[in-house]
């Protein structure tokens, strides 16, 4: 729970935040996600690092795996087998981009408390998993999948053409990882462990990015990504699935791309198990408007997968790209062939429809002007899901219980009015069979993360409530935070606003507009946060406002496809709109009024601050694209088009930061950027800086020397405190 | 007893127009898809069409959907099949059925009524 | 879908067991029904789901396949077995009916 005002007599015992409190994360908090292995048990890493095994129905836990045995290898992250015959430990982390890292990997056999001897596995490991069934492993190593029937045996290597920077199995390429897939991993195993399925990427024709990573020897290192920007060459992708149990027997088998695919490129998006004999592809045109989902059934005769035209179910836009940020996945039905999955109705808002003989004939199951986020489970009587419908706020999301095994299906909102005040933007986890699950509650209040009962609901018990944080909190002035909209030209503003502990509305004060703005991105919601903005407004007595302009996420199609194939228009225009709407609430000092933002959002302030209004006195950008030419073709391609004459390049030209430099004149900019920026190419912030120069338009800037996107370590203190300094004295507030 | 009474046969003329109906008691009617089902003299059994519980979704057999109209007043507890334009080979036994709603999201037919003779002659 | 069920006649004798087919021209992944008529009756629902029997069906009837291929066997025919048999799918409409089975009395 957010710590209640107190009364003036106290209020000197109250201390504003500090910029160190946000430096050393001394107001943040824990979650707790259960590790299931059953219907009715967990697994958690206690305070003391030992592996505990918690059985919900007895109440009792065992300790399976010591911080003796971890420590032993200085092992970071554990998994057991689904035979609980045996844990992996993984130590040497190793990160590479957003989610892949390699590792090495230690067995340990439970059933004698010893590490497995012989046949150990090669290192650093790319990616390793445990079959879903029994003991079984495999691995990728040197861009090659391996396979092991037990942890102790040789490996079968089930793939040969690996190749640094060139042919990847079983895990993807940069742009795959990044903006596609979303994981470190590019294999499945079926449910019971018979198949396993991966993809395999060939990049060969795709332009490299090549970088210098200075480090401490006399000569600098050149990084070289293949990574495809808008307009490039893609990789090429193909899906194989073999049989785990005679892996020599027939080899790896291609599932074949649907025709309407096929027929011009194309990408995969995503692969779900059904059955151990029947699997479920996505696939997405380039031009991503047309996304088709393909069932496929082994056929035992010709030990082939066959993918008939009849199980092909199309989905496409007609007024954007497929999907949201992604096509949804699908989530399937106890029948093993209809499944229910999240695209937009015929209202235009993101609903879940029941899919049996074909997508036309789609029962909906939920409507209404909100939308529905993620399925979490199925169960034979039960659909569990999120949405953001409870009293209209787009920025909470609630957990959601739908009987389907009778008619008419009944709604339940499980958490709506569980702890009100204090949780309104919720996630959850659910157990095998939807026997119990986790509810982990991220604020607006305080997170609390408490276990249900899966058939009543009921809370069991609390399994972390961040009593440290609350304690810690109790004497500490946070900043007052609203969430509200603004109506305008039928458009709805979402605005968070994070006002001064001590805010009086007659007096006038500094406004830092914190912005994103991406496309399908949300920044305004309701969950607990103790940062840099809080800071600001605690200490030094800004305001700050975030909104959600055109283009983001959850309030339906017309808001969320009205960027489309026009990034860097309306975002900037609502952001300034927004503005405009806080001044005329009358406590806004008009002279002193900022914006910066990360990433997209360091594009958006930056066309914010050369947009020619005169509203900004100055503003950061901190690793932003400049130009869409720079950016990653399946990201970019989604929302703009091609960078063609015959398609979208007019507007890839006019959204640049380049072309406005002139419109710098009149404001403070600050840019940022770090030199091994994998993901936004530093690049960007080059192209900036030579256009201000060739204008002679005077900035600061900063770069972070062999610092990737997400400028972390001491690059993240030094990062704050510039910003910090520069806001500061843009606002002229005293240090 | 669930039970379903269809009414409304007889003798039409060609080109002619007849409603059927189908009054269902001892169940919760307002829950349960309905269809109808058509079975010519010595022949086998035709599905016609379905409408679910609250007739946002009806379904028709191709052949007939231009000419036949199924409708149902769930205060009456009443099923419909408007007849229209009808032709020598409508002759038949037409047979109204309930279903049990079926996980997931499908329906059986349980309960059939003892059908009503429409005989098409000039 | 057309379903196409054979023998389209059958006779047996009490105690015999018979087996029914139903083919459909594509794949309706058991969303497949049984149904029982006897001489002047409304049809009555064996099976349903390729194999799950009906409330109050009598365990000698048995539904199963898979895919294209269904069959409905009636273990130790019953003198009260006799009747016109039905398949029918549930895939995606039209719901059709197969052609029918009259199993009579050798």
């Known amino acids: 729970l957010r710590p209640s005002r107190v009364h003036n007599s106290e209020e000197n015992t109250m201390r504003a935040l500090t910029l160190k409190d946000i430096l050393n994360g001394t107001f943040s908090y824990k979650t707790f996600f259960p590790n299931w292995i059953s219907g009715q048990e967990y697994l958690h890493q206690s305070a003391d690092n030992n592996i505990v095994l918690y059985n919900i129905e007895t109440g009792q836990s065992y300790t399976i795996l010591s911080n003796r045995t971890m420590k032993s290898v200085n092992a970071s992250n554990y998994g057991l087998s689904p035979d609980r015959q045996f844990v992996y430990l993984e130590s040497d982390y190793s990160k590479l981009w957003r989610y892949s890292y390699t590792a090495t990997y230690y067995i340990y056999d439970l059933s004698n408390g010893e590490f497995v001897r012989g046949n150990e596995l090669p290192r650093p490991i790319q990616y390793l998993c445990w079959s879903p069934v029994g003991s079984k492993l495999a691995y990728v190593y040197q861009n090659n999948i391996y396979l092991k029937q037990r942890p102790g045996d040789p490996p079968f290597q089930i793939t040969f053409n690996g190749r640094e920077n060139k042919i990847f199995n079983g895990i993807p390429d940069w742009v795959y990882e990044e903006e596609m897939l979303a994981t470190k991993y590019a294999l499945w195993w079926s449910p019971n462990g018979k198949f396993l399925a991966y993809a395999e990427f060939n990049d060969t024709d795709i332009p490299v990015i090549a970088y210098s990573y200075y480090g401490d020897e006399q000569y600098p290192r050149t990084i070289n990504i293949p990574y495809p920007k808008a307009g490039a060459k893609n990789p090429v992708v193909r899906i194989f699935i073999i049989d785990t149990t005679y892996p020599a027997y027939v080899g790896p088998q291609e599932v074949p791309v649907p025709a309407m695919i096929a027929s011009s490129d194309y990408y995969f998006s995503w692969l779900t198990w059904v059955t151990d004999e029947r699997v479920c592809l996505q696939w997405l045109k380039r031009v991503q408007n047309v996304s088709v989902l393909s069932i496929c059934d082994f056929r035992e005769d010709w030990q082939t997968w066959d993918c008939p035209k009849t199980q092909e179910h199309i989905e496409e836009s007609r007024t954007g790209w497929a999907g949201g940020f992604f096509v949804s996945t699908p989530v399937f039905s106890y029948d093993a062939i209809s499944y229910y999955k999240i695209f937009s109705d015929k209202d235009g808002y993101k609903h879940i429809h029941y899919i049996k003989d074909t997508v036309e004939n789609a029962i909906q199951i939920t409507s209404g002007k909100w939308e529905a986020i993620n399925i979490f489970r199925v169960t034979q009587d039960s659909l569990f899901y999120s949405s953001n419908e409870f009293e209209e706020y787009p920025g909470r999301r609630n957990i959601y219980r739908i009987s389907i095994g009778s008619y008419p299906p009944s709604k339940k909102c499980v958490t709506c009015h569980l702890r009100k005040e204090r949780c309104q933007y919720y996630t959850a986890s659910f157990s095998d069979y939807a026997k119990y699950y986790a509810l982990v509650c991220y604020g607006p209040g305080i997170p609390i993360s408490t276990l249900h009962d899966g058939r009543t609901d009921q809370e069991i018990k609390i399994l972390e409530e961040n009593k440290e944080l609350e304690n810690a909190l109790k004497n500490i002035q946070l900043p007052k935070e609203e969430i509200k909209k603004l109506e305008v030209d039928e458009i709805t503003l979402w605005y968070k606003m994070i006002l001064p502990p001590q805010f009086d509305r007659s007096k006038k004060y500094p406004l830092l507009i914190q912005v994103y703005g991406g496309p399908c991105s949300q920044s305004v919601r309701s969950v607990f946060a103790v940062n840099w903005i809080s800071y600001l407004a605690s200490k030094e007595g800004m305001v700050i406002a975030l909104v959600d302009g055109r283009g983001t996420a959850f309030q339906g199609d017309k808001l969320l496809y009205a960027v489309y194939r026009k990034l860097g228009v309306y975002e900037v225009e609502d952001q300034i709109t927004a503005v405009r709407k806080f001044i005329e609430m009358g406590f806004i000092d008009e002279k002193r009024i900022a914006i910066w933002g990360w990433s997209y959002g360091g594009y958006v302030s930056s066309l914010a601050l050369a947009s020619g209004t005169g509203l900004f006195k100055c503003g950061i950008a901190v690793a932003p694209v400049s130009s869409w030419e720079y950016y990653a073709s399946v990201y970019t391609e989604r929302f703009m088009g091609l960078p063609t004459k015959d398609d979208n390049l007019e507007h890839y030209k006019n959204s640049t930061v380049m072309a406005r430099a002139e419109y710098f004149r009149n404001v403070d900019y600050l840019l940022i950027h770090g030199t091994a920026d994998d993901n936004v190419h530093f690049q960007n912030s080059a192209q900036i800086a030579k256009a201000l120069v060739n204008a002679q338009v005077d900035f600061q800037a900063m770069w972070y020397s062999d610092q990737n996107h997400g400028l972390s370590g001491l690059s993240t203190n030094h990062l704050y405190t510039h910003m910090t300094h520069f806001l500061k004295q843009c606002f002229s507030l005293s240090d | 007893e669930v039970q379903l009474l269809e009414s409304g046969g007889g003798l039409v003329q060609p080109g002619g127009s007849l409603k059927l109906s189908c009054a269902a008691s001892?169940?919760?009617?307002?829950?349960?898809?309905m269809s109808w089902v058509r079975q010519a003299p010595g022949k086998g059994l035709e599905w016609i069409g379905e409408?679910?519980?609250?007739?946002?979704?009806?379904n028709y057999t191709p052949s007939l959907k231009d000419k036949f109209i199924i409708s149902r007043d769930n205060a009456k507890n009443t099923l419909y099949l408007q007849m229209n334009k009808v032709r020598s080979d409508d002759t038949a036994l037409y047979y109204c059925a309930g279903g049990y709603y079926r996980y997931p999201y499908y329906y059986t037919m349980d309960y059939w009524g003892q059908g009503t003779t429409v005989t098409v002659s000039s | 879908l057309v379903m196409t069920q054979s023998p389209s006649s059958l006779s047996a004798s009490v105690g015999e067991t018979v087996t029914i087919t139903c083919r459909a021209s594509g794949n309706i992944h058991n969303y497949l029904a049984w149904y029982q008529q006897k001489q002047g009756k409304s049809p009555q629902l064996l099976v349903y789901?390729?194999?799950t029997l009906a409330d109050g069906v009598p365990s000698r009837f048995s539904g199963s396949g898979s895919g294209t291929q269904y069959s409905l066997k009636i273990n130790s025919l019953q003198p009260e077995d006799f009747g016109s048999y039905y398949c029918?799918?549930?895939?995606?409409?039209?719901?059709?009916f197969g052609g029918g089975t009259k199993l009579e009395i050798k």
């Open positions: 789901n390729a194999k």
């Open positions: 029918q799918h549930f895939w995606s409409t039209p719901y059709t």
């Open positions: 409408i679910n519980p609250d007739s946002s979704t009806i």
């Open positions: 001892g169940f919760d009617f307002s829950t349960y898809w």
